[in-house]
Amino acid sequence: AVDLTLLANLRLTDPQRFFLTCVSGEAGAGRGSDAWGPPLLLEKDDRIVRTPPGPPLRLARNGSHQVTLRGFSKPSDLVGVFSCVGGAGARRTRVIYVHNSPGAHLLPDKVTHTVNKGDTAVLSARVHKEKQTDVIWKSNGSYFYTLDWHEAQDGRFLLQLPNVQPPSSGIYSATYLEASPLGSAFFRLIVRGCGAGRWGPGCTKECPGCLHGGVCHDHDGECVCPPGFTGTRCEQACREGRFGQSCQEQCPGISGCRGLTFCLPDPYGCSCGSGWRGSQCQEACAPGHFGADCRLQCQCQNGGTCDRFSGCVCPSGWHGVHCEKSDRIPQILNMASELEFNLETMPRINCAAAGNPFPVRGSIELRKPDGTVLLSTKAIVEPEKTTAEFEVPRLVLADSGFWECRVSTSGGQDSRRFKVNVKVPPVPLAAPRLLTKQSRQLVVSPLVSFSGDGPISTVRLHYRPQDSTMDWSTIVVDPSENVTLMNLRPKTGYSVRVQLSRPGEGGEGAWGPPTLMTTDCPEPLLQPWLEGWHVEGTDRLRVSWSLPLVPGPLVGDGFLLRLWDGTRGQERRENVSSPQARTALLTGLTPGTHYQLDVQLYHCTLLGPASPPAHVLLPPSGPPAPRHLHAQALSDSEIQLTWKHPEALPGPISKYVVEVQVAGGAGDPLWIDVDRPEETSTIIRGLNASTRYLFRMRASIQGLGDWSNTVEESTLGNGLQAEGPVQESRAAEEGLDQ
């Protein structure tokens, strides 16, 4: 069972001094900040017993395994149900405390009732302040039964519950009709899931025979020991004032555990500490009685004396619960009450015994839960004891349960049962998560859900390049921290797996599923510089750049050109996907705009250093295209062009530009300026005879405008080859006159 205790301080003279403390003896309990241990919760449960609202209660955490509830301002704040929740995962356990008002009309003779399935439970409410009205019994807040006030027997109202079943468990209350619910007697009924002395899914397993008032847990067969007792069967008493599964906790205050109620996981419930009794746990046990609530009787033999905390204290030469066993009878010594091993291990178990005659190797045997008897492989004989060592065959899950060490001599026999827990090493259910990556390192979160048993003692991360047959590299990490895998190869896939371990030999679990994590490319280091740029139009810019010469292959996939339009707050990015490129034409720019320009090398998703920036001013956009361009051959070397001025001009034209190109030719076109913008005609001279030419033109105001349509015309034949076209222009009318 989970080591969880809810302590209620019952010194009720002042509710403001009242407190509840929940103490966990579980490893890592209450930390809450990591995934391995949820926090302890301590709260009032108002679902069944509703009290008038008051100031909120104060919760204080004292270290990792203790939480205290204070801030009760009036007695009614105390009445009701409180619960503490602790333990992790499937072991998460709720411990419940029910508080009754000392001034209630009805008081419970006994608050906690633990009964077996099929038993008859009897709840008894004692009349404290009589009212001549009906008594209403409720179960978990809902009406359950009515008694006429005449039905009281010896000043008590009894509720008989025959053949109880686990669903009957819960909070019961007895209240006078017309009385405040706070004047009720509140009870807690715990119905074990099995009949007496049985546990397990089909109630087929036999309980270990819990001593000193311990209660056998119906799910796992463990004894839930009363406060002040320990051991597999609660056979050992703690020192006075101590509690917890290993007697590790100490009652607060100078008067020890006086005035404290202890609540433990079901099916135990609540009781006073060992040596105390009464509704407020302030009365010491009467002579001859001991234990929690003083429920146990000493009945010491052979001169033993009764200690109200631990029971019989035996004189020299005697031992046993009632000092009934002579020291001549062999006795198992210092056997651990609980041992834990990992699945498929082959542990060694030691069992020591003393007696007269002295036990020898063959007289000590070990019995497994399935009845198999193991004989010791060796024994160490010392003056005061013999220690037998047993080599246990490979453990399976079915070996979990109660084992027994037994010693037999002619002087008699003794046996000691102990619990063996076979734990399953943890196996990750998921692959680790990649958090960030660089060219030579991966940052990984190893924290994954797992099957099997905790706690997790170590986490190993195994990794190697994908498709590699080389040995795995391994790193041992803290379970709660992220891990950085370093000195990796860039642009390489790595197979990464988690392996979890729990404490003890053989606690390493199988490796979890692999995941592929890929390192980034190496960062490009070369810084380009801009060689130059020129404007090829109002919205076109040709840029060229260079890189420093370095030995070895170029680390890069291409270039990124960035143009920043500061006026509009816009960035234009142009990707040049060849690392060999050293020039690019940027089109679709905004005419008349001032750009800041830079270039940087990229590799995969990583960018190298940017070039020093350049500042470029694009000319404003030009006028519309001239209209109705027409070409007419005049001779074997002359062609006349005529046109109409563009429409909707934004200002006066400064010149026209004519583009001349031989049709089907591979050479660059020739551009000829017409510097008299009022002209609508020009003659292109110096052309080759019998040659077909293409013409188009555009106007310029502050910047060049759009091209006109292209026209074709051939010069007349059989002339001499000209030196090249030249231009002569005049008004169209004048040309026509000539």
Epitope: R50, T133, D134, I136, K138, G141, S142, Y143, F144, Y145, T146, L147, D148, H150, E151, T175, L177, E178, A179, S180, P181
Partner: antibody
Framework: EVQLLESGGGLVQPGGSLRLSCAAS????????MFWVRQAPGKGLEWVSR????????YYADSVKGRFTISRDNSKNTLYLQMNSLRAEDTAVYYC????????????????WGQGTLVTVSS | QYELTQPASVSGSPGQSITISCTGS?????????VSWYQHHPGKAPKLMLY???NRPSGVSNRFSGSKSGNTASLTISGLQAEDEADYYC??????????FGGGTKLTVL
Amino acid sequence: EVQLLESGGGLVQPGGSLRLSCAASGFTFSSYMMFWVRQAPGKGLEWVSRIYPSGGWTYYADSVKGRFTISRDNSKNTLYLQMNSLRAEDTAVYYCARVTVPLDSGSYYFDYWGQGTLVTVSS
Amino acid sequence: QYELTQPASVSGSPGQSITISCTGSSSDVSGYNYVSWYQHHPGKAPKLMLYDVSNRPSGVSNRFSGSKSGNTASLTISGLQAEDEADYYCSSYTSSSTWVFGGGTKLTVL
């Protein structure tokens, strides 16, 4: 589903006797206090008698005391009302009713009623 | 003679609100907060509508509400609907550990 079904009503002469039954289902009959309530023609409701779950304690309205007897058989989930020395003023529809104590309440309320059975006392 | 006094009849149009009063004494209505109201359609079983003066059992519409002042308890039905037409009875626990009912009020939805 909680159900209460009365039977046994009918026409009877003054001074005569009748035994009413109420069959209960859908709840743990043996845990509940049960009532008989009646309604005379054109009149309001009037509580007649009550019996505690154990059957050991019974109470009656003054108008029927000494003439009517309430009883129950928890093994049969049935409530009874034995009516003797009937009078004309006992003519009414007789309802059996269950009481409960709602959460957070300190009193009983009639949470389920039967459809009623008519008793006519006339010569 | 009934120990709790109710008006014999009340009427209202659909959508309107109506209030039915129930007057008792210090030994019942004013002495306890244990007043309840029952709705009774003739030929059917009565139905608990309110308990502890103003609490509604689950399944009862929130159009039904209750209050108490001195020795008079009241049932208010808002947003009147045709199916609300029925007889309504108030009831109170008494100091003599008995129950008293009102004479009933016939609610007509016009």
